[in-house]
């Protein structure tokens, strides 16, 4: 468990309930030892994960962990779906679990649904 393999700590079956029009940061927690790997985000389209090009991304450092962040400025209804980050480490590709964004379009929602309502979707 303390090996120097790159680890991508996106939780299996994780999700985020968010609203169109709001800003949102999707974080990929990355553990590495010496050299920070190259990390990318992709969006799932069926079984294919389509690489997200030209998007605003950044790094954040916390104690033992770095976070590769995908910025949504703002969230669009079309951002609904599942995302995965992957790291290029020693010429091997390490893929995270996918995380799902449930986007509520506030134009079509008379009021913002509660977290419980969104979680039950």
């Amino acid at each position: 468990k303390e090996s120097c393999d790159v680890q991508l700590y996106i939780k299996r079956q994780s999700y985020h309930s968010i609203f169109a029009g709001d800003p949102f940061k999707l974080e990929c927690p990355v553990k590495y030892c010496a050299h920070r790997p190259q990390v990318t985000w992709c969006k799932l389209n069926g079984t294919t994960c389509v690489k997200l090009e030209g998007r605003h991304t950044s790094w954040k450092q916390e104690k033992n962990l770095s976070f590769f962040i995908l910025h949504f400025e703002p969230v669009l209804p079309s951002d609904n779906g599942s995302y995965r980050c992957s790291a290029n480490f020693l010429s091997a590709i390490i893929e995270s679990h996918s995380t799902t964004l449930y986007v509520t379009d506030v134009k079509s929602a008379s009021e913002r649904p509660s977290k419980d309502e969104m979680a039950s979707r």
Epitope: K1, D5, L8, Y15, E95, A119
Partner: antibody, heavy 121, light 112 residues
């Protein structure tokens, strides 16, 4: 080293509620799922549910919906389960367990020592 | 819910002899991501459970290699090549492919 600290025992009257705690050290619970598992005397294990402390999202086994409420406080690195309307059927050991996901898919990696809950008048 | 059925209920084994525990699920545990989320836990007397094996056959760190997990779909097996005194306790299989997560009823390993 990861440790999960739970209180040893609780004695509660029927009809009352109780809130059990589980404090993690050696790991930031924001990067994990925190689970609660029930074990009645001389019986097997039952999964109650889990929380994603990063965003408060919860999932419960339907049979514990309404009975258990799982919360987390990331500032104290602590997860809680509140059990309501207690009866003798709730007398059991309650374990917390910490699951984290990396590229090698670790989960249910660490368990607390359990809190023995006795419901008795 | 997925029902996990373990056999036997109790296993009485002489130290140094092999042991085998079966776990059958009521539906396939192969997930859409291609992985099978089947784990084995050991609960020693008076202790909390400890995971031995995850993803059917991967040994947790510190688990002796006399333990092996195998199987696919709905049929899984935990084998101990040579039982030692520290192996006694209750073994549980547990699935995390389908919601809600469910455990087998447990197999008690006794030393003869």
């Amino acid at each position: 080293e990861v440790q999960l600290q739970q209180s040893v025992a609780e004695l509660v009257r029927p009809g009352a509620s109780v809130k059990l705690s589980c404090t993690a050290s050696g790991f930031n619970i924001k990067n994990t799922y925190m689970h609660w598992v029930k074990q009645r005397p001389e019986q097997g294990l039952e999964w109650i549910g889990r929380i994603d402390p990063a965003n408060g999202n919860t999932k419960y086994d339907p049979k514990f919906q309404g009975k258990a409420t799982i919360t987390a406080d990331t500032s104290s690195n602590t997860a809680y389960v509140q059990l309501s309307s207690l009866t003798s059927e709730d007398t059991a050991i309650y374990y917390c367990a910490l699951t984290y996901y990396g590229s090698s898919q670790h989960y249910f990696d660490y368990w607390g020592q359990g809190t023995t809950l006795t419901v008795s008048s | 819910d997925v029902v996990m059925t373990q056999t036997p209920l109790t296993l009485s084994v002489t130290i140094g002899q092999p042991a085998s525990i079966s776990c059958k699920s009521s539906q396939s545990l192969l997930d859409s991501d291609g992985k099978t989320y089947l784990n084995w836990l050991l609960q020693r007397p008076g202790q909390s459970p400890k995971r031995l094996i995850y993803l059917v056959s991967k040994l947790d760190s510190g688990v002796p290699d006399r333990f092996t997990g195998s199987g696919s779909g709905t049929d899984f097996t935990l084998k101990i090549s040579r039982v030692e005194a520290e192996d006694l306790g209750v073994y549980y299989c547990w699935q995390d492919t389908h919601f809600p997560q469910t455990f087998g009823g447990g197999t008690k390993l006794e030393i003869k």
